[in-house]
Amino acid sequence: IWELKKDVYVVELDWYPDAPGEMVVLTCDTPEEDGITWTLDQSSEVLGSGKTLTIQVKEFGDAGQYTCHKGGEVLSHSLLLLHKKEDGIWSTDILKDQKEPKNKTFLRCEAKNYSGRFTCWWLTTISTDLTFSVKSSRGSSDPQGVTCGAATLSAERVRGDNKEYEYSVECQEDSACPAAEESLPIEVMVDAVHKLKYENYTSSFFIRDIIKPDPPKNLQLKPLKNSRQVEVSWEYPDTWSTPHSYFSLTFCVQVQGKSKREKKDRVFTDKTSATVICRKNASISVRAQDRYYSSSWSEWASVPCS
Amino acid sequence: RNLPVATPDPGMFPCLHHSQNLLRAVSNMLQKARQTLEFYPCTSEEIDHEDITKDKTSTVEACLPLELTKNESCLNSRETSFITNGSCLASRKTSFMMALCLSSIYEDLKMYQVEFKTMNAKLLMDPKRQIFLDQNMLAVIDELMQALNFNSETVPQKSSLEEPDFYKTKIKLCILLHAFRIRAVTIDRVMSYLNAS
């Protein structure tokens, strides 16, 4: 058993049918010595008396808010949560496996640049009685500071019969140098509590591996005289690290017909312009990627050919 | 993804082309190592990230773009003195900081070159003959060093009398390639920045 926060405790259980569970001793936070009784949650049934209460915690029915009273007055509370260990592996019931970029990916994180700011998000089908708390650091043995905000509900989607909820959090490394070569990964730890179930999820990454630039901005077409060709031009996104001559991007320009089946013409360039043939009803899209370290491509920025 | 091949203009900063080749070569070598050594811990998540140049050179700090010198987190002021005569420097633009930067890059390359050559000698003794260093990568390191053209003491190749542990050598190869790739990215950024200056 360990303390998650004041008066909230997590009991770690080896989870299998007929498991013996864990013996837990609760102590009433009071100078009083006698006349103390204990109850669980809203029940008025007295579970025991005395300054300490010994319980065998086996299942969720044994978890909850234990309260010690004296003469009708509440003295203190202890909330017991359960953390299930199933055959050597901690349970992952609360969050959905996003399966990207690989199986057992519960937390996904992205950064728009090298400033040390990043966003993480996760999915769940649970709508109520759910709380998250997020901590982060650079490295784990001698951790350096990363400050995370509060997790917020960022999107709701309908998936088949189920509703899916996306939560996200923004974090900022306290003293980040965009040009630094990372040798210690960022660690992100999310504590999730659903009713009386506790779970924790972690992700470890280098900022360089989670870079995903914003799409190029100011995408414009300039027709070339007496030609079906157009000059496409764009700019680096505002959120990208500066100077651009140091943090360079490479670009992919795509001409896509109205139908998804039509052949796509693609050109790769390090410049912020390209000459392409504009077909009728086609659209031109441009996306960006770090020129020197191949992390994710940005989303497409698009303009119609007409 | 294959990096686009740049054809240098005659007046172009001479080292940019070589640094692009370097990044391409080390990226290819790392990919090959990860595929060949699939049963070894060779991915970024599995290895310890060690920098053999730590406390010996200060490339990131010495080559910091002017715009980032205002960022206190970037100023780890590790003062290292270097020889300052490089052929990559167009003499009118020569500045002490730029010379310091390029000589730091040269020292990095020299250290990695020695490590890779020592390691290759060990790998050639492996009866499994599983993996060797790409000669192209070693040649590209050499070309960039020549383009930088700094006079510096030659570092003797380390020789080891004891029987090599091939498992450890292959893991060390992965660690070295990951670190060198990161340094090659920095070198490419620096050359691109200097080229634009």
Partner: antibody, heavy 115, light 112 residues
Framework: QVQLVQSGGGVVQPGRSLRLSCAAS????????MHWVRQAPGKGLEWVAF????????YYADSVKGRFTISRDNSKNTLYLQMKSLRAEDTAVYYC????????WGQGTMVTVSS | SYVLTQPPSVSGTPGQRVTISCSGG????????VKWYQQLPGTAPKLLIY???QRPSGVPDRFSGSKSGTSASLAITGVQAEDEADYYC????????????FGTGTKVTVLG
């Protein structure tokens, strides 16, 4: 004590269907994940499928994906394996099993796919 | 296809020490627990070892399990006639958990 009693095995022709059941008692069935494991005659153990305690997630071996469906009825304390498009290579003893460090197995039920 | 490899058979005379190996990889045994089962003919498998080296109550202490790196082993010290059975190791793969990965199985024969 924990008990898992299996039923539903038998002889079936290729291409036909069969449903296996596993009735649980002696524990809170709705709190635990469950597996199906099979063993072809004279062969080793092969995992078939898993279902979460609440039925929210199901996992299948590639060899049965799209043909077999694992399900549970927590109000009846019963686990099921619906097998469709059966093949000769599905012939095996099928076991249900609880998930956890200490597990309990059903007695097994024989499924024979033969024309 | 089996990812955990065991020897097809091992044998020993009563009182001898018999060991069965179970060889896997970094993504399974290397990063997950190992269990061992004993299966007597015509019966369901019986748990012998869980959590690499833990014995459930009721399992004789002549059975012991260990794990090192990407391999595990089961030792029977002082093998007895009633130990003649098939033995299976089991683990998980970190990418496909909770799918069970079973070893190929080892037939233990007690001679004499």
């Amino acid at each position: 004590q924990v008990q898992l009693v299996q039923s539903g095995g038998g002889v079936v022709q290729p291409g036909r269907s069969l449903r296996l059941s596993c009735a649980a008692s002696g524990f809170t069935f709705s709190s635990y994940g469950m597996h199906w494991v099979r063993q072809a005659p004279g062969k080793g153990l092969e995992w078939v499928a898993f279902i979460r305690y609440d039925g929210s997630n199901k996992y299948y071996a590639d060899s049965v994906k799209g043909r077999f469906t694992i399900s549970r009825d927590n109000s009846k304390n019963t686990l099921y394996l619906q097998m469709k498009s059966l093949r000769a290579e599905d012939t095996a003893v099928y076991y249900c099993k609880t998930h956890g460090s200490h597990d309990n197995w059903g007695q097994g039920t024989m499924v024979t796919v033969s024309s | 296809s089996y990812v955990l490899t065991q020897p097809p058979s091992v044998s020993g005379t009563p009182g001898q020490r018999v060991t069965i190996s179970c060889s896997g990889g970094r993504s399974n045994i290397g990063s997950n627990i190992v269990k061992w089962y004993q299966q007597l003919p015509g019966t369901a498998p019986k748990l012998l070892i869980y959590g690499n080296d833990q014995r459930p109550s009721g399992v004789p202490d002549r059975f012991s399990g260990s794990k090192s790196g990407t391999s595990a082993s089961l030792a029977i010290t002082g093998v007895q006639a009633e130990d003649e059975a098939d033995y299976y190791c089991q683990s998980y793969d970190r990418g496909t958990h909770p799918a069970l990965l079973f070893g190929t199985g080892t037939k233990v024969t007690v001679l004499g």
